[in-house]
Interface confidence: low
Amino acid sequence: MRTFNYWKKRNVRGPEPVVFFGNLKDSALRKKNMGVVMEELYNMFPEEKVIGIYRMTSPCLLVRDLDVIKHIMIKDFEVFSDRGVEFSKEGLGSNLFHADGETWRALGNRFTPIFTSGKLKNMFYLMHEGADNFIDHVSAECEKNQEFEVHSLLQTYTMSTIAACAFGISYDSIGDKVKALDIVDKIISEPSYAIELDMMYPGLLSKLNLSIFPTVVKNFFKSLVDNIVAQRNGKPSGRNDFMDLILELRQLGEVTSNKYGSSASSLEITDEVICAQAFVFYIAGYETSATTMAYMIYQLALNPDIQNKLIAEVDEVLKANDGKVTYDTVKEMKYLNKAFDETLRMYSIVEPLQRKATRDYKIPGTDVVIEKDTIVLISPRGIHYDPKYYDNPKQFNPDRFDAEEVGKRHPCAYLPFGLGQRNCIGMRFGRLQSLLCITKILSKFRIEPSKNTDRNLQVEPHRGLIGPKGGIRVNAIPRKLVS
């Protein structure tokens, strides 16, 4: 058993670890979400640039200083291109999010074009259809009961949107497959202790060829991809969606990560690699946006003045556009976009951010040298609630994202999508599908707290991402038609 004197020997301050768990006892026992634990650790040493912590028995560095973060995420990205998630690359392990630096380069170059403005505009009509179906469903339900648990409800919208935009699946045509949601949700909601095992014995999962993904999830994505490949006769269909791109890669047979295209650094595009990408797009496309929208609706219920301003903006923009929500009108709504940004400040979904040093590295502005393979962690939540950067951080205030205010802040004081080259590839997609749906909701409903609205909302400890414990209950009140 490694001893907990690694950081002491290097004169790096940090909280006292406990045997076996290091500093992660509460998250390992699923008493608290990992993101919340990291925020607490961040807050323990307000004067330190970096904090030495232990994830189970592995020493890691939690970085607090924004200039150091800028080096790690942007300036010295080459050293930190790897996320340091070590498990079997069979199954779903070779996905774009978890892939090592080289695999990520090979894949990332290929997938970035999916999210150009032109492609997003093409996807918009599919999102629109999903949003209309969603609103029809809410309207119908409203006649029976005005209280909704919006988190699970919004998952049905984002699930159908990602299915349509990425895979060309219209879920209404699949009937009982509509709720593929459940399968995918297993990943996020059912705790796997494989992650803790990796923290204790880095590389063990890889060595034993163990995955962190349940077999049922792997099988689901295999059959999803098999069906779509069969439907399209193994060739791109001309839809130019995510699946077409994957089929192009499948025809190529491999992709290379370096600019010379040497086969030594090429990634063979097997059906397993394809399944892995399908998986990560699904997860990233539905859960993050659904949770963000749910939290945004929660804050609008608790802040009627802000909601009124948003409704006024939505009404005004829709009136000027014959009642139509378009790709451009969504971008036009300044206050709506600011409210979305403020939601992500308060509820950054992916916590913590993680990188691995690919060589020894001296932390700028300190005497600390971290060894090759050390995991570096960043707590967006810690930063986002730090009064040093945000006054009255627990208050929902979209005005923090006025251009002038943003300009005054350090560029690394806001990290909901990560930062640098390995930031969130789908952030524009997520914003678009979220703001479209919120616009539709506000054009038809006023959101109010219900008798079951939890005003002291906790973070679900069992989920890998940030999410509301027990869901979010609010009332949706149909707005009376005003002539």
């Epitope: 699970s152 049905t156 009982d176 709720k179 459940d182």
Partner: nanobody
Framework: QVQLQESGGGSVQAGGSLRLSCAAS????????MGWFRQAPGKERELVAD????????YYSDSVKGRFTISRDNAKNTVYLEIDSLKPGDTAVYYC????????????WGQGTQVTVSS
């Protein structure tokens, strides 16, 4: 395990109505959605409607939209299928099924109830 018991089937004239019920018992907390399927003689079993327990999200197959209404009573752990304007083509064994969280296919089935529509 989830046990399902259908009732309400029978013989009816074309244009008539029926209300099928499906009572669930056992580990119903694991059940995420309930569906009604039907199987006509010599044909494959098809999903006609389903409903999620949590948020009441509903699906209808195109062939029954407008004539079939699925609803639920969470307190009674019961799902209903209201069938209006019955046609001879609706003659089939109607099965109630339940789907657990974490699965895409329906994994618990009732015994089925016969619906016969005569012209």
């Amino acid at each position: 395990q989830v046990q399902l018991q259908e009732s309400g089937g029978g013989s009816v004239q074309a244009g008539g109505s029926l209300r099928l019920s499906c009572a669930a018992s056992g580990r119903t907390s694991r059940s995420y959605a309930m569906g009604w399927f039907r199987q006509a003689p010599g044909k494959e079993r098809e999903l006609v409607a389903d409903i999620a327990w949590s948020d009441g999200r509903i699906y209808y197959s195109d062939s029954v939209k407008g004539r079939f209404t699925i609803s639920r009573d969470n307190a009674k752990n019961t799902v209903y299928l209201e069938i209006d304007s019955l046609k001879p083509g609706d003659t089939a064994v109607y099965y109630c099924a339940s789907r657990a969280r974490g699965t895409v296919s329906y994994n618990y089935w009732g015994q089925g109830t016969q619906v016969t529509v005569s012209s």
